[in-house]
């Protein structure tokens, strides 16, 4: 760092005050020298290191006609918004001739209400739930004491004497309002106000109370929601495709969900209209006049099968002699499952009626006993799915064939003898 | 006699741009701040911002930050302000001020002791 | 950024009277405060800087005071040329901010 030397006189007749200040003071510190000749630089040292970018100006008024006669410097060093990084030891350099100059000291010091760090934020938490609240603050001077306000109220009898830096708070069953003052020796500042919302706790114990094909029925335990009311809960349902892969806790689905209200008590709802033998995802969170609570985890829930809605489509029956030949198409309406097969029933007028399993085929060539001279003989169809049979189709009659029409030439089926079923 | 002068201003668009400048005389600029202050019709005083035109360091008010440019030109003795993506609530008398330079060691803040005639943006 | 508040935001006077004229900062401003002048279609001019320190060229009747947060501008016996409007000024700290004015008209 540049010294000043005694050997000859100062140049200096104005040295650097001082200036003692809060944070984001405006301040100007200024020396003065009588030179003669030519006026040199003025340079700013802090503790003696060299400001390379300090913001000074510099005048120059020459105090006679001849440029060798003597002249007065100011140079001016502006502090446009004090921090601590300023604060030091200020000193004017110049060097004339082989010489360096510097000035007496001038100190900048920091000093006021104390400045906050770091200030309690607004959050939400659940009722009863704990949590901690942060503060921190610095001088100078020093020390800093802190204390903290619920709802405007002290929760220490002085400063320093509760909890510092991190207010742990065991739960509130209101919302309430947080702030911490910081004492120095300068005086008091206050911290801003954080809000904090009390919400509903995340519903419990979320599970299937009954399953229908196209109908689930839920039921969960309610949180604590401190001094409010719950208004209402909100159930939502997504289907479990293998894409939206939605994960326990996932804050929010990729898709729009199904969305149901349900007002309180009971703590019950039933979701219609759902697709049978479905895997869904459900999940429920509950509201008070403070806001929402947290959703629960997605519960994987899934519909039942349920028996196909249809008949089977377009059947078709026509008799050759001794055979009858029968195909159909699977039903229109929905399965409501997975199809397992066929059954199939068959009758003449005097005659009890045949039920065979046709299995997933859908066609079938029936012998027909004696010489096939049983008269009305009829046939109907359902479709069955592990949950249980479909409607029967209306019987259809068995049609003489007619030589032309097509007949595609079908595995022989032996008619069994299966106990008689009326009709649907 | 120290003087300032400012001149440059005018009707403009929303959007455009203006230059406006502030001669000094009867004092050097580099010696000093010199500020930007607007009056808007029938309003009161507000800060544009500084430049120090020994360094060319300049401020800025916040309403103005990242449109407004402050120059200085030490061998012209003249500062200027350039004004882009002029707005409608810009519009207000321009004035720049020198300012106060006390013969103290140090002070805390400012005052402006000398004034433009204004020009009328 | 610090609020100046000045009051009365205007007064009538006589030629002769006493004005008092305060302005109260938002925050301590030590006594970084001045005041000025301005008169219809003219540049404000400079009073009192540094809260009580008058200006070079200033009428003695002008004075100023105050530190912290409470300012006053006094001019101690109104003359004809003193109707104008006075602002205040902080500078403690960057942005400098402005009162709103104190019209002072003839009763």
């Known amino acids: 760092a540049p010294r000043g030397t005694q050997a000859e006189e100062s140049p200096f007749v104005g040295n650097p005050g001082n200036i003692t200040g809060a944070r984001g003071l405006t301040g100007t510190l200024r020396c003065q020298l009588q030179v003669q000749g030519e006026p040199p630089e003025v340079h700013w040292l802090r503790d003696g290191q060299i400001l390379e970018l300090a913001d000074s100006t510099q005048t120059q008024v020459p105090l006679g006609e001849d440029e060798q006669d003597d002249w007065i410097v100011v140079s001016q060093l502006r502090i446009a918004s004090l921090q601590l990084s300023d604060a030091g030891q200020y000193q004017c350099l110049v060097f004339l001739g082989h010489q360096n100059f510097v000035s007496q000291p001038g100190y900048v010091g920091l000093e006021g209400l104390p400045y906050f760090l770091e200030e309690p934020e607004d959050r939400t938490v659940a009722a009863n739930t704990p949590f901690n609240l942060s503060c921190q603050a610095q001088g100078p001077p020093e020390p800093v004491d802190l204390l903290w306000l619920q709802d405007a109220v002290p929760l220490a009898t002085a400063p320093g004497h509760g909890p510092q830096r991190n207010l742990h708070v065991p739960g509130l069953n209101k919302t309430s309002s947080f702030s911490c003052e910081a004492h120095n020796a300068k005086g008091v500042t206050t911290s801003r106000t954080a809000t904090i919302t009390v919400l509903p706790q995340q519903p419990r114990n979320l599970h299937l109370v009954s399953r229908q094909p196209t109908e689930l029925e839920v039921a969960w335990t309610p949180g604590l929601s401190g001094i409010y009311p719950l208004t209402h809960c909100t159930l939502q349902a997504m289907l479990s495709d293998n894409e939206v892969g939605i994960q326990a806790g996932e804050p929010d689905p990729p898709e729009e969900p199904l969305t149901l209200q349900a007002s309180v008590p009971p703590h019950q709802l039933r979701l219609g209209s759902l697709h049978p033998h479905t895997p869904y995802h459900i999940r429920v969170a509950c509201t008070s006049s403070q806001g929402l609570s947290s959703w629960t985890h997605w519960l994987p829930v899934e519909t039942p099968e349920g028996v196909p809605l249809g008949p089977p489509e377009n059947i078709s029956a026509t008799r050759n002699g001794s055979q009858a030949f029968v195909h159909w198409q699977e039903p229109r309406a929905p399965l409501q499952g997975t199809l397992l097969g066929y059954r199939l029933a068959y009758q003449g007028q005097d005659t009890p009626e045949v039920l065979m399993d046709i299995g997933l085929r859908q066609e079938v060539t029936l012998e027909l006993q004696g010489d096939g001279s049983v008269s009305n003989l009829t046939v109907c169809v359902a479709a069955y799915t592990a949950a249980g049979d479909g409607p029967w189709s209306l019987p259809v009659p068995l049609e003489a064939w007619r030589p032309g029409q097509a007949q595609p030439v079908h595995q022989l089926v032996k008619e069994t003898s299966a106990p008689a079923f009326s009709w649907p | 006699e120290v003087q300032l002068v400012e001149s440059g201003g005018g009707l403009v668009q929303p959007g455009g741009s203006l230059r406006l400048s502030c001669a000094a005389s009867g004092f050097s600029l580099s010696g000093s701040w010199i500020h930007w202050v607007r009056q808007a019709p029938g309003k009161g005083l507000e800060w544009v911002g500084w430049?120090?035109?020994?360094?060319?360091?300049?401020y800025y008010a916040d309403s103005v930050k990242g449109r407004f440019t402050i120059s200085a030109d030490t061998s012209k003795n003249t500062a200027y302000l350039q004004m882009n993506s002029l707005r409608a609530e810009d519009t207000a008398v321009y004035y720049c001020a020198r300012e106060y330079s006390g013969w103290g060691g140090s002070s805390v803040g400012y005052a402006m002791d000398y004034w433009g005639q204004g020009t009328l943006v | 950024d610090i609020q100046m508040t000045q009051s009365p935001s205007s007064l009538s006077a006589s030629v002769g009277d006493r004005v008092t004229i305060t302005c109260r900062a938002s925050?301590?401003?030590?006594?970084?405060v001045a005041w000025y002048q301005q008169k219809p279609g003219k540049a404000p001019k400079l009073l009192i800087y540094s809260a009580s320190f008058l200006y070079s060229g200033v009428p003695s009747r002008f004075s100023g005071s105050g530190s912290g947060t409470d300012f006053t501008l006094t001019i101690s016996s109104l003359q004809p040329e003193d109707f104008a409007t006075y602002y205040c000024q902080q500078s403690y700290t960057t942005p400098p901010t402005f009162g709103q004015g104190t019209k002072v008209e003839i009763k």
């Open positions: 925050q301590d401003v030590s006594t970084a």
């Open positions: 430049i120090n035109p020994y360094r060319g360091y300049a």
